[in-house]
């Protein structure tokens, strides 16, 4: 599972007029991390774990970066010709990742009124546009605006993603929080299903990092993929994650089934409660 930093910026227009503010959130490893407080011109940590990641840092450069990015996105929205009456939004999502082999990936996506219309792979400098005619028109608008100073744009995007990766590395290097290992709490529950069957659910919560194996076993052998139902691995708001796996079994055979969990080199098995 790579480490990632994800910037999500949104600007709004009303009746063709671009609004002065912008919304910005930053996610670190999928967790809400920073939010831009527009009134105070400050990037604010989201919750205690985010504060712990950087301790007593002021977030001064994060604040300035987000403010500059918001201004850029407002200018981009001003160049979209498609704006009719009412409320419209332009959203930019930038993601940079550092993988276990130290390779990096950076991408950027633009959405208009919630619809994806332009993506860029920063490494390959390749732009992708969905097939719809609206997306094509919007993409042409934005690409033309960005290409007005093509070299500056190219440099700008490479610098932006270099900054993203630099920030991510700084967070990873400086933070004990991101290097910690928090084992999951595993809880198995059962609920009655139809015709002598029961549904057994295995929940893992409050674990870090995100990588986890959670699967049902019968007589010590993992069940096939299609007989199990998995939940997404989701942030729980405390800098840790949660997930679940469920399967349906015959009543009376509970003792043959166990939930197998593997996380950060540790593993455990958990029986179905009787």
């Amino acid at each position: 599972e790579p480490h990632s930093l994800r910037y999500n910026l949104t600007v709004l227009s009303w009746d063709g007029s671009v609004q002065s503010g912008f919304l910005a959130e930053v996610h670190l490893d999928g967790q809400p991390f920073l939010r831009y407080d527009r009134q105070k011109c400050r990037a604010k940590p989201q919750g205690q774990w985010a504060e712990d990641v950087l301790g007593n840092k002021t977030w001064d450069r994060e604040t300035r970066d987000l403010t500059g990015n918001g201004k850029d996105l407002r200018m981009t929205l001003a160049h979209i010709k498609d704006q009719k009456e009412g409320l419209h939004s332009l959203q930019e999502i930038r993601v940079c990742e550092i993988h276990e082999d130290n390779s990096t990936r950076s991408s950027q996506h633009f959405y208009y009124d919630g619809e994806l219309f332009l993506s860029q792979n920063v490494e390959t400098e390749e732009w992708t546009v969905p097939q719809s005619s609206r997306a094509q028109t919007l993409a042409m608008n934005v690409r033309n605006f960005l290409k007005e100073d093509a070299m500056k744009t190219k440099t700008h995007y490479h610098a932006m993603h270099a900054d993203c990766l630099q920030e991510l590395r700084r967070y990873l290097e400086s933070s004990v929080v991101l290097r910690r290992r928090v084992p999951p709490m595993v809880n198995v529950t059962r609920s009655e299903a139809s015709e002598g069957n029961i549904t057994v659910t295995c929940r893992a919560s409050s674990f870090y990092p995100r990588n986890i194996t959670l699967t049902w076993r019968q007589d010590g052998v993992s069940l096939s993929h299609d007989t199990q139902q998995w939940g997404d691995v989701l942030p729980d708001g405390n800098g840790t994650y949660q997930t679940w796996v469920a399967t349906r079994i015959c009543q009376g055979e509970e003792q043959r089934f166990t939930c197998y969990m593997e996380h950060s080199g540790n593993h455990s098995t958990h029986p179905v409660p009787s």
Epitope: Q39, K40, N56, T58, D60, R61, T63, R64, T67, R170
Partner: antibody
Amino acid sequence: QVQLQQSGADLVRPGASVRLSCRASGYSFTNYWMNWVKQRPGQGLEWIGMIHPSDSETRLNQKFKDKATLTVDKSSNTAYMQLSSPTSEDSAIYYCARDDFFTMDYWGQGTSVTVSS
Amino acid sequence: DILLTQSPAILSVSPGERVSFSCRASQNIVTSIHWYQQSTNGSPRLLIKYASESISGIPSRFSGSGSGTDFTLTINSVESEDVADYYCQQSNIWPLTFGAGTKLELK
């Protein structure tokens, strides 16, 4: 143009608290943090803390947490700093300075505080 | 707290000379350094922000450079009005801190 007008020099008795004022004009007072900075005679600058006039959120240098209290009055565009139980160590010039992304872009003329019995 | 060490304490130069002020941080603060000038009996004035960004209204002879822990403020041709104390300030870590200053004198 941006101006920060600070109150006049103060001679205070040890232990008697003192309140300094900083009146802002020429910009939207509630949109910017206000810093307070201390400078002892012949010495360097020391950051005391900052306050945001919109809701009075404050960030204090821990060294001054029992010494300085920052407040604002939005109706008069004025920031205040109260110094409690002053001693000779608190004799200094105190500046208010407007914050711009953690830099201090406009400064008041300073208020001289002398603590003496 | 971040310690900012300014050197030398006093710089003595002739008008027209190029002069450099040094500021060293006790740990990596990226580019979060700002420079101020304070004339005798005056308030500080912001000269350079974020290591190298110029400030509107400040003469172009003032420039800044550096990142990480070592930073420099340069006046490329000193004028008599530049006689003052010069302070660096960091904004990367709470609390915000200033260097002890360098006094610029004319020979």
